[in-house]
Amino acid sequence: SGTTNTVAAYNLTWKSTNFKTILEWEPKPVNQVYTVQISTKSGDWKSKCFYTTDTECDLTDEIVKDVKQTYLARVFSYPAGNVESTGSAGEPLYENSPEFTPYLETNLGQPTIQSFEQVGTKVNVTVEDERTLVRRNNTFLSLRDVFGKDLIYTLYYWKSSSSGKKTAKTNTNEFLIDVDKGENYCFSVQAVIPSRTVNRKSTDSPVECMGQEKGEFREI
């Protein structure tokens, strides 16, 4: 058989952050190539990454068509230089991925504090609304556009001079918090989707502290 040295892919894994979605698998190919197919539960298979020697395939363009659908992918193995060859059952070797629902499973990317502004004893902290690769009407949607009120942010803030952290939450991209006059504060934010069962939280944003150039201070 022409497939004697062909092995099926294994360890198929979805890697997805803010809907940028890549399927990874093993092994590194030796005398073989791969083609990936993706489908929704009720849809037709679409081929991607034809006859590649890579062990990953970017499927973002497919999943962003409807991030609430559940997707299944499969990786076909072919002998290098003889991609028409089939296995003993009359079709190429392939392995199925786990199911993947982008809306429920994509990792939330590390957020960024866009700005903070102090007015007297109030500080307004704004989180950047990151653009995703999800499109509608030829425009890219932001994370907030996609998740709406399902997405909240948690703010951690503390006096520069102490380690005791306070928290605040918002279902928008802005916080308005009370601070002590004359004190400098540091801030970090985390994206959270409370309704999820997996991948509920992002990593924390980089810390930003008052007295640095990102913020603005106004004495009233």
Epitope: Q69, R136, N137, L141, F147, K149, T172
Partner: antibody, heavy 120, light 111 residues
Framework: QVQVQESGPGLVKPPGTLSLTCAVS????????VSWVRQPPGKGLEWIGT???????YYNPSLKSRVTISNDNAPNTVSLKLSSVTAADTAVYYC??????????????WGQGTLVTVSS | DLQLTQSPSTLSASVGDRVTITCRAS????????LSWYQQKPGKAPKLLIY???TLASGVPSRFSGSGSGTEFTLTISSLQPDDFATYYC???????????FGQGTKVEIK
């Protein structure tokens, strides 16, 4: 073709229940929300409520005790029920698609509307 | 409850005029920007013009533009065309789960 279309009786007797159906085509209710909006003759638009792409419902506080929106009766349809109707509920009723899929107020596809008269 | 107040209620203008309609919210709209503008002609369904405060909806002429944030928003028609005489509504989502609201409308009529 992406469209929504309202249907239901044009006359309802008080204090009965107004029941309308919105048939959608060309898009998935698992990805887009649907809102109901009404317009009394010669007056402005009033938001009734929304069912989002996750099936959660949101209602105008002034109508909340009387309104139910659901999409579990048939595939690709959203229903509106408004109970204990009075003449003040006489209006053109519209269903419309929510562009973002949640209760965002951005309604990009509208039905032609159906006039419901409440009268005995 | 979220309340949206449009001004003016009626606006008389001529073809070629620059027209501005204001929408004020009783409290900040959701994430300061989820406000939409609609055009409605008699006997017809409303048509989405602008969403997310400033994004032009598909197929809408570029003479329409939107701006604003938080509680104050404007719809501008840079050069009024005969087809633009209609009633305009703003609509917004609010941070609380329940509320979406429409403004009372602004009728743009021929001077």
């Amino acid at each position: 073709q992406v469209q929504v279309q309202e249907s239901g009786p044009g006359l309802v007797k008080p204090p009965g229940t107004l029941s309308l159906t919105c048939a959608v085509s060309g898009f998935s209710l698992s990805y887009y929300g649907v809102s109901w909006v009404r317009q009394p003759p010669g007056k402005g638009l009033e938001w009734i409520g929304t069912i989002d792409s996750s099936g959660r419902t949101y209602y105008n506080p002034s109508l909340k005790s009387r309104v139910t929106i659901s999409n579990d009766n048939a595939p690709n349809t959203v229903s509106l029920k408004l109970s204990s109707v009075t003449a003040a509920d006489t209006a053109v009723y519209y269903c419309a698609r929510d562009f973002y899929g949640w209760n965002s107020g951005a309604l990009d596809i509208w039905g032609q509307g159906t006039l419901v008269t409440v009268s005995s | 409850d979220l309340q949206l107040t449009q001004s003016p209620s009626t606006l008389s203008a001529s073809v070629g005029d620059r027209v501005t309609i204001t929408c004020r919210a009783s409290q900040s709209v959701y994430s300061n920007k989820y406000l939409s503008w609609y055009q409605q002609k008699p006997g017809k369904a409303p048509k989405l013009l602008i969403y997310k405060a400033s994004t032009l909806a598909s197929g809408v002429p570029s003479r329409f533009s939107g701006s604003g944030s938080g509680t104050e928003f404007t719809l501008t028609i840079s050069s009024l065309q005969p087809d633009d005489f209609a009633t305009y509504y703003c609509a917004a989502a609010y941070s609380d789960d329940s509320d979406t609201a429409f403004g009372q409308g602004t009728k743009v009529e021929i001077k």
